[in-house]
């Protein structure tokens, strides 16, 4: 009987939280073991059975007495209105074409949640609804009182709705935004009484798909897959995310424990190709990303191990290491980097199966180095391993350069006192720790006479008292391995302090630019000598060696200070290694105004004149070259005398100024004065920068014409 293939035992249950109706039914009259395709037409009505709001055809394969299920999600919260459901069925199977017509409808199954609500005068639905931003949401209130006027507010803004029936009003919210993690607040309240109800609508940010999905293996046994989860949903507890890895070739699936990575055991059956789907899922939606790759192309080797630096000499060292195997036939490409003073100074690539070895050449003796190695799959490069690093220090070698030596010669009681200075060798020249310096004195008048002095480091000089003979002095630096080449300097019986005219030089920001005349005859080089702390007993003697073809140099130093006079001496070095003085230069890196004024004496006072005189004072101590003097004269006279001009002082007083532009002049006669008149004078030197400090004026009164009678 065809009509008997009808849906029976229809049950409807509800899931308020998800706003779902769940239908359960079965078809009883199928023959045993019979399996037919059927289609079920489902109708859902709201409030009245005549108001059908949903019709859907659901197709499935049916067995005898099998429980069939179908769910429907309502846009309207189920508490807002009564819903009714009915269905009918039809066979839709090629096996029985004659049965293709609808069965009778089932009776309407009524779902009325309102009847189970409490006795409160007002209810608002849905409760704790969770949606993604941009969704449309339907809200309603159910009122138990016809008299009360109910107003509903979304975040304090009144909403306008449609009345479903006298007790129910519905509000349609379009494109809801994410506001805050605690959700969106909706309140409904009655005009009369103190009835108020609130609900929270949880709006999450859109669930994004995972980014940067990638898988790799370090040992061909485990794949480590990583990804960046999409941005935070913006809600605290409502939206937990789950991540699932599915591999299509093996058909295996794993639920990931962590939200940004997952491990996958590699199949022992030598599966090479992997096709992963990573599915991120939350309550609201699923997002999937795919990745297809060959396992051997995704090898990220482990860091090299058993790394040693062996056979370390002064200039060579050998690095050895082992690599973790990544399969029987694979070759690893290893990269070696050598660091010196924090910079890469050598880089090399080496192919390795199991053991690696690399010789590092052209190293500096007694130097700290760091060597590091990392490896990658040579056949299919994916990623480098981590570096494994080793520090080592090369062995010492004999110093490679002669010390830079200079001397100062003084004649004391018929003896020659020679102070020797040398600069410490640079790290590069010393090739190890300098332990001592050897000074060998060779008397040129008695060549077989040698004297050896051994001076422990870190001394940078020594004092020798020699007789008037000529000597050649050899200085070497010594470390644990050997001796440096010798530096040779000669001292003749004549101290060689001939008189040389001193020339002025002007310093700049860059230093002092010194030049000299080239020397006729053979010179092996030049030396420029100066003190960095002139006036200080220790002086801090400095020198600069220059080649035989050099006739100028710039001397610069951070120690140069404004207002300090620096004296430079330029020596030629003869072929016999004897220094001789060529030129003297003196100057300031920056001149300043004079620091003080000379003491002035007045003499020869007459009715019409007086004479001023002042002592010469140490030019060395002046903060600039004195170019002359300014004499200021104050008097009652309105006009300035010949040879002077009007000047305004710092206190705005007016006086007359005489300019004395000869710095060697030490007397000055003030003439053309008036008898029995009061005058005041003040003398100050000036440099290229300006005058000295303004001091106190000295008072003087000329006698009257007849005072001598």
């Amino acid at each position: 009987e065809p009509l008997s293939l009808a849906p029976e035992s229809l049950e409807v249950s509800i899931d308020s939280a998800r706003q779902c109706l769940h239908l359960k039914w079965s078809v009883h009259n199928l023959a045993y073991h019979q399996e037919l395709k059927m289609v079920f037409q489902i109708e859902i009505s709201r409030i009245k059975t005549s108001n059908v709001i949903w019709v859907e055809n659901y197709s499935t394969t049916v067995k005898r007495n099998q429980v069939l299920r179908w769910s429907w999600e309502s846009k309207l919260p189920l508490e807002c209105a009564k819903h009714s459901v009915r269905m009918r069925g039809a066979v839709d199977d090629a096996q029985v074409p004659e049965l293709r017509f609808w069965s009778n409808w089932t009776s309407w199954e009524e779902v009325d949640v309102q009847s189970s609500l409490g006795h409160d005068p007002l209810f608002v639905f849905p409760k704790d609804k969770l949606v993604e931003e941009g969704s449309n949401v339907t809200i309603c209130y159910v009122s138990r009182s016809h008299q009360n006027n109910i107003s509903c507010y979304l975040e304090g803004v009144r909403m306008h709705g449609e009345q479903l029936d006298p007790n129910v009003c519905v509000f349609h919210l379009k494109n809801v935004p994410f506001i805050r993690e605690t959700g969106t607040n909706i309140y409904c309240k009655a005009d009369q009484g103190d009835v108020i109800k609130g609900i929270v609508l949880f709006v999450s940010k859109v669930f994004e798909e995972p980014k940067d999905f990638s898988c790799e293996t370090r040992d061909l046994k485990t794949l480590n897959c990583t990804w960046a989860p999409g941005s935070d949903a913006g809600l605290l507890t409502q939206l937990s995310q789950s991540y699932t890895l599915f591999e299509s070739f093996s058909g295996k699936k794993t639920l990931c424990k962590y939200k940004s990575w997952c491990n996958w055991q590699v199949s022992p059956d030598s599966q090479e190709m992997y096709n992963f789907t990573l599915t991120a899922e939350n309550y609201l939606r699923k997002r999937s990303v795919h990745l297809l790759f060959n396992l051997t192309h995704r090898v990220h080797p482990m860091a090299p191990f058993n790394v040693f630096v062996k056979n370390v000499s002064a200039t060579n060292a050998t690095m050895t290491w082992k690599v973790h195997s990544i399969g029987n036939y694979s070759t690893l490409l290893c990269q070696i980097e050598l660091y010196g003073e924090g910079k890469v100074i050598q880089k090399q690539n080496v192919s390795v199966k199991v053991n690696g070895k690399h010789l590092m050449k052209k190293l500096e003796p007694s130097t700290e180095y760091a060597a590091q190695v990392r490896c990658a799959n040579a056949n299919h490069f994916w990623k480098w391993s981590e570096w494994t690093r080793r520090n080592f220090t090369t062995a010492e070698a004999a110093p490679s350069e002669a010390p830079d030596v200079w001397r100062n010669v003084k004649s004391v009681q018929g003896h020659c006192v020679v102070t020797l200075f040398w600069k410490p060798l640079s790290k590069l020249q010393a090739n190890g720790k300098i332990l001592f310096y050897n000074v060998v004195l060779e008397n040129l008048d008695r060549p077989s006479t040698l004297k050896l002095l051994s001076i422990p480091a870190p001394a940078n000089g020594t004092e020798l008292t020699l007789d008037r003979c000529s000597y050649q002095i050899h200085v070497t630096a010594n470390n644990s391995v050997g001796t440096s080449p010798a530096s040779v300097i000669a001292v003749s019986g004549d101290p060689g302090n001939k008189e040389v005219e001193e020339e002025r030089v002007k310093g700049t920001e860059d230093g002092f630019c010194l030049s000299w005349k080239p020397q006729p005859g053979d010179v092996t080089g030049y030396v420029v000598e100066w003190c960095e702390r002139p006036g200080d007993p220790l002086c801090d003697l400095q020198w600069k060696n220059l080649g035989p073809n050099t006739t100028s140099t710039v001397v610069s130093s951070d120690a140069f200070r404004p207002g300090v006079r620096y004296n430079f001496r330029i020596y030629g070095i003869s072929t016999e290694r004897i220094p001789y003085l060529l030129e003297k230069k003196t100057g300031y890196s920056q001149e300043l105004v004079p620091s003080d004024n000379p003491q002035v004496l007045m003499s020869n006072l007459t009715s019409y004149s007086f004479t001023l005189s002042w002592k010469d004072y140490a030019a060395e101590s002046q903060p600039g070259f004195v170019q002359g003097y300014s004499l200021y004269l104050k008097s009652k006279a309105a006009r300035c005398l010949p040879g002077s001009e009007k000047a305004v002082l710092s206190d705005d007083s007016i006086c007359c100024k005489y300019k004395i532009d000869n710095p060697k002049q030490k007397t000055f006669v003030v003439e053309n004065l008036q008898p029995a008149s009061f005058y005041e004078f003040f003398l100050t030197p000036y440099t290229s920068v300006g005058e000295g400090p303004q001091g106190a004026f000295t008072k003087v009164t000329t006698p009257d014409e007849y005072s001598h009678i």
């Epitope: 939280a17 609500l117 409490g118 006795h119 409160d120 209810f123 409760k127 704790d128 507010y153 975040e155 304090g156 506001i179 805050r180 993690e181 605690t182 959700g183 607040n185 309140y187 108020i196 109800k197 609130g198 609900i199 929270v200 605290l236 507890t237 409502q238």
Partner: antibody
Framework: DVQLVESGGDLVKPGGSLRLTCVAS????????MAWVRQAPGKGLQWVAN????????YYLDSLKSRFTISRDNAKNTLYLQMNSLKTEDTATYYC??????????WGQGTLVTVSS | EIQMTQSPSSLSASPGDRVTITCKAS??????VAWYQQKPGKVPKLLIY???TRHTGVPSRFSGSGSGTDFTLTISSLEPEDAATYYC?????????FGQGTKVEIK
């Protein structure tokens, strides 16, 4: 008449446990968020925990999460706060409160919890 | 956590005075702010929610305003029965937090 009545407050030693109970009446209990708020003697208000309508979501002050548990029994119109490993700084009056949403429109009279050795 | 800072911490005013209490949030809380009144020896009572909505039964002299980080509770004409401590509360982010309170005394 809408009412919340707390009980269970007591003097307890540090490290001890207490269970606070709140019985609701005069409204449909399952239709509201509920919470606990505390007030130390002479001090201000401090939110402790919240629970949603059916107890499926709970929210806590981070520093109390490991020691306090909020729960509800809608059939009995009752709210609970289980407090373990109590510390002297937990001494306060504990209020059972009803939430409109996250704002609190009905407050119980409070129950005093004293933690002292 | 979001800090809610109330000022002043206490004030004294005469009946009929206009009283303003401010609450500053350490970060944007939109309008998710409530105000409570607690009279001495009594339990707190909700006055305002969503920053400016007066709760049912609250006298119209109480009003709330503000959004973002700055909020104000105003009593337009102080009554003797308004002597109490007033608290603001934010419910924009967890944990929910209260201000430290402002004590209002009547001269």
């Amino acid at each position: 008449d809408v009412q919340l009545v707390e009980s269970g407050g007591d003097l307890v030693k540090p490290g001890g446990s207490l269970r606070l109970t709140c019985v609701a009446s005069g409204f449909t209990y399952s239709d509201y968020y509920m919470a606990w708020v505390r007030q130390a003697p002479g001090k201000g208000l401090q939110w402790v925990a919240n629970i949603n309508y059916d107890g499926s979501s709970t929210y806590y002050l981070d520093s109390l999460k490991s020691r306090f548990t909020i729960s509800r029994d809608n059939a009995k119109n009752t709210l609970y706060l289980q407090m373990n490993s109590l510390k002297t700084e937990d001494t306060a009056t504990y209020y059972c409160v009803r939430g409109l949403t996250w704002d609190f429109d009905v407050w119980g009279q409070g129950t005093l919890v004293t933690v002292s050795s | 956590e979001i800090q809610m800072t109330q000022s002043p911490s206490s004030l004294s005013a005469s009946p009929g005075d206009r009283v303003t209490i401010t609450c500053k949030a350490s970060q944007d809380v939109d309008t998710a702010v409530a105000w409570y009144q607690q009279k001495p020896g009594k339990v707190p009572k909700l006055l305002i929610y969503l920053a400016s909505t007066r709760h049912t039964g609250v006298p119209s002299r109480f009003s709330g305003s503000g959004s973002g980080t700055d909020f104000t509770l105003t009593i337009s004409s102080l009554e003797p029965e308004d002597a109490a401590t007033y608290y603001c509360q934010q419910y924009s982010r967890f944990p929910l937090t209260f201000g430290q309170g402002t004590k209002v005394e009547i001269k």
